[in-house]
């Protein structure tokens, strides 16, 4: 992965980040598949939306999701070069109003109604990973990410900078 | 402040080889992906390789695969370009680069060393 | 392989006059699009990123815009210190290409 050596001696820097910016620099509408190319769905049910992790039949046509890129300071210290420690985060909008949201202790992935400013949680540093994967990973829980577990968007704890390449938490973003 | 400084370059025959290396300061190297780009006397930019912070992923332009290999030791502060089976067309001034943010490559490149030339000719 | 295309390759213009230099992916890359200007004999320094984004440390005359496919670099009013050449380059995807650059010369 890029940006990488141990995921725990920059990540603890995200608690103490702050998006430099409120607006986003750029945003992106995109699809949303894993490594092994299955799409992520947005499904109503009940009034709540549910997140799937699936094969799309032949011209199904895929979800979009909204990308909103945020630049994020890294305190000094930590990046070891002043200013200069940028990281890229991002959130992610399905739908008007709704956000993938990180739930840390369900260890899961949700999609939650809010307004902006938008909570911490609505947040994910952005990883480019193996060849031209992307990996997202909490803004609250260094060394979590968002994964795929039993068909379904879990959050996954990263312990190494090995396991950063794993194909559960890599994704791929197609404009079509 | 950062710095980037190659060295390696020089003069080398066709079928030759040459190591190019940047010493990097004034940052944490392990954090970001590290590139190299060349540019041909009077001629434009080329991207040629580029590595992960971890040293775990590496790409190569079309040009170059299979010839060049990229590597870092971070405990050294360094990034090498190992070149073999050079070519004339392959005589440029090599850049090591760093890239604007420390997870992702895609800002684009921050900083740039000074370059160091190499000159394939027989 | 994304291949960059920029036009013009090279401008003549005055001092005060407005520049516009395009880029064209063949094909998406989002807003993933860096600006490089290049000095005679220097290193080339980043002047915009994410298509739109000015580095700091450059004046505001400098603007990038585009998505997609197009993208365009503008200097509003051109300084003495903007002759130059200018690269694009996509960070979108493996392997990274550069535009062949743009020349910006005194009429």
């Known amino acids: 992965a890029f940006g990488i050596s141990g995921v725990q001696k920059y990540t603890r820097a995200l608690h103490d980040s702050s998006i430099t910016g409120i607006s986003p620099i750029t945003e992106y509408l995109a699809s949303l598949s894993t490594y092994n190319d299955q799409s992520i769905t947005f499904a109503l049910e009940d009034e709540s939306y549910e997140i799937y992790v699936e094969d799309l039949k032949k011209d199904e046509k895929k979800d979009k999701v909204l990308l909103s890129y945020y630049e994020s300071q890294h305190p000094s210290n930590e990046s070891g070069d002043g200013v200069d420690g940028k990281m890229l985060m991002v959130t992610l909008s399905p739908t008007k109003d709704f956000w993938l949201h990180a739930n840390n202790k369900e260890h899961s992935v949700e999609l939650h109604k809010c307004e902006k400013p938008l909570p911490d949680q609505a947040f994910f540093v952005l990883h480019n990973m193996h060849s031209n994967c992307v990996s997202f990973e909490c803004k609250t829980d260094p060394g979590v990410f968002i994964g795929v577990k039993d068909n379904h968007l879990a959050l996954i704890k990263v312990d190494s900078s090995e396991n950063l390449c794993t194909e559960n938490i890599l994704f791929k973003l197609s404009e079509t | 402040e950062v710095q980037l400084v190659e060295s390696g370059g020089g003069l080398v025959q066709p079928g030759g080889s040459l190591r190019l290396s940047c010493a990097a300061s004034?940052?944490?190297?392990?954090?970001?992906?590290m590139s190299w780009v060349r540019q041909a006397p009077g001629k434009g930019l080329e991207w040629v390789s580029a590595?992960?912070?971890?040293?775990?992923?590496?790409y190569y332009a079309d040009s170059v695969k299979g010839r060049f290999t990229i590597s870092r030791d971070n405990s050294k502060n360094s990034l090498y370009l190992q070149l073999n089976s050079l070519r004339a067309e392959d005589t440029a001034v090599y850049y090591c680069?760093?890239?604007?943010?420390?997870?992702?490559?895609?800002?684009?490149?921050?900083?740039w060393g000074q370059g160091t030339l190499v000159t394939v000719s027989s | 392989d994304i291949q960059m295309t920029q036009s013009p390759s090279s401008v003549s213009a005055s001092i005060g006059d407005r520049v516009t230099i395009t880029c064209r992916a063949s094909?998406?890359?989002s807003s993933w699009l860096a600006w490089y200007q290049q000095k005679p004999g220097k290193v080339p320094k980043l002047?915009?990123?994410?298509?739109?984004s000015l580095q700091s440390g450059f004046p505001s005359r400098f603007s990038g815009s585009g998505s997609g496919t197009d993208f365009t670099l503008t200097i509003s009013s051109l300084q003495p210190e903007d002759f130059a050449t200018y690269y694009c380059?996509?960070?979108?995807?493996?392997?990274?290409?550069v535009g062949q650059g743009t020349k910006v010369e005194i009429k």
């Open positions: 002047l915009i990123y994410a298509a739109s």
């Open positions: 680069a760093k890239t604007l943010y420390t997870t992702s490559w895609y800002g684009g490149f921050q900083h």
């Open positions: 380059q996509q960070t979108h995807s493996f392997p990274w290409t």
């Open positions: 094909q998406g890359i």
């Open positions: 004034g940052f944490t190297l392990s954090s970001y992906a």
């Open positions: 590595i992960s912070g971890s040293g775990g992923s590496t």
